[in-house]
């Protein structure tokens, strides 16, 4: 079928990076500057995306692939293909209409983007707070209060608060 198609349609022989030029007897012509074709058999080349202003070029346009943009330092992408750039904040902050604001007590944000989220409520899982939360970090939940009561474990003492990853054996 592929051979039949190429006999009937000379354009199918045009590789990526070229287009089938109807103005020149369907000769395969290279894509003009600032355009590309990522597949063979194209009748036109697509215009390259331009990265300007708040966007910077992450990947240059070539004759076979489009340019890719990301955001200039201090900004992060929104949308699947980086259609918009939003200002970074510090960890422990969120971006509001009035700019970057510290997370309210009881909430945290460990990234430069996104919103402040409530600390985990350890008691909902029957656990106690091992390490207190901050604006930048969630609380660390430890063993349940019952596990920490005197005599509950006669072999291994409860882990000190400075080792949040370690729990009694």
């Amino acid at each position: 079928f592929e051979r039949t198609r190429s006999l009937q349609d000379p354009c199918s022989n045009c590789p990526a990076g070229t287009f089938c030029d109807n103005n020149r007897n369907q000769i395969c012509s290279p894509c003009p500057p600032n355009s590309f074709s990522s597949a063979g058999g194209q009748r036109t080349c697509d215009i390259c995306r331009q990265c300007k202003g708040v966007f910077r070029t992450r990947k240059e346009c070539s004759s076979t692939s489009n340019a890719e943009c990301d955001c200039t330092p201090g900004f992060h992408c929104l949308g699947a293909g980086c259609s918009m750039c939003e200002q970074d904040c510090k960890q422990g902050q969120e971006l509001t209409k009035k700019g970057c604001k510290d997370c309210c007590f009881g909430t945290f944000n460990d990234q430069k983007r996104g919103i402040c989220r409530p600390w985990t409520n350890c008691s909902l899982d029957g656990k106690s707070v091992l390490v207190n939360g901050t604006k930048e970090r969630d609380v660390v939940c430890g063993p349940s209060p019952a596990d920490l009561s005197p005599g509950a474990s006669s072999v291994t003492p409860p882990a000190p608060a400075r080792e949040p990853g370690h729990s009694p054996q």
């Epitope: 331009q50 202003g53 708040v54 949308g79 699947a80 293909g81 980086c82 918009m84 750039c85 200002q87």
Partner: antibody, heavy 115, light 107 residues
């Protein structure tokens, strides 16, 4: 709060120049660029040009010979100047912060070109 | 320059109806299309960026879709406050270009 406030004349004589100032607050012109867009009454939007955070400019080729966009970072002001105005330049002119998708617009300056 | 063509030019709707507005690009612009709402005597407001991403605070009755050359804005349950002009624009290549707009009116 991000704000762009425009000031400029409402009436311009044919063949004269139009000057509009866009004063911004809530962000710095050393971080963000600013675009200019116009809208003739009852018509669509038309991109005119932009000045980027570093001070370089891009203009719509249809206006490059009579358009100038400059800025003063310390005063948080952008200056838009268009020469040789004609009747069909009558429009609302907007400054818009550059974030890739035009989320923050000025209130607009209605400009009528008439003798 | 990339030409953005919107259709229809205007449409009359009743509250509660579903509306589809269309925008066609003369070239492949990927998903780099934004939709704006403009009420009388106001500046345009961003509704959708990147063809389908709702901007902060935009009600979820507004949905954008499409890629390459064909894009739609759907308002699933039109409210009286949605009566306005709607503009599409491409942010893919310079000069940036916009459609002529669609006016949404009340029946």
């Amino acid at each position: 709060q991000v704000q762009l406030k425009q000031s400029g004349p409402g009436l311009v004589q044919p063949s004269q120049s139009l000057s509009i100032t866009c004063t911004v607050s809530g962000f710095s012109l050393t971080t963000y660029g600013v675009h200019w867009v116009r809208q003739p009454r009852g018509k669509g939007l038309e991109w005119l040009g932009a000045i980027w955070s570093g001070g370089s400019t891009d203009y719509n080729a249809a206006f490059i010979s009579r358009l100038s966009i400059t800025k003063d970072n310390s005063k948080s002001q952008i200056f838009f100047k268009m020469d040789s105005l004609k009747a069909d330049d009558t429009a609302i002119y907007y400054c818009v912060r550059d974030d890739g998708s035009f989320a923050n617009w000025g209130q607009g300056t209605l400009v009528a070109v008439s003798a | 320059n990339i030409v953005m063509t919107q259709s229809p030019k205007s449409m009359s709707m009743s509250v509660g109806e579903r509306v589809t507005l269309r925008c066609k690009a003369s070239e492949n612009v990927g998903t780099y299309v934004s939709w704006y709402q403009q009420k009388p005597e106001q500046s345009p407001k961003l509704l959708i960026h990147g063809a389908s991403n709702r901007y902060t605070g935009v009600p979820d009755r507004f949905t954008g879709s499409g890629s390459a050359t064909d894009f739609t804005l759907t308002i699933s349950n039109v409210q009286a406050e949605d009566l306005a002009d709607y503009h599409c624009g491409q942010t893919y290549s310079y000069p940036l270009t916009f459609g002529a707009g669609t006016r949404l009116e009340l029946k």
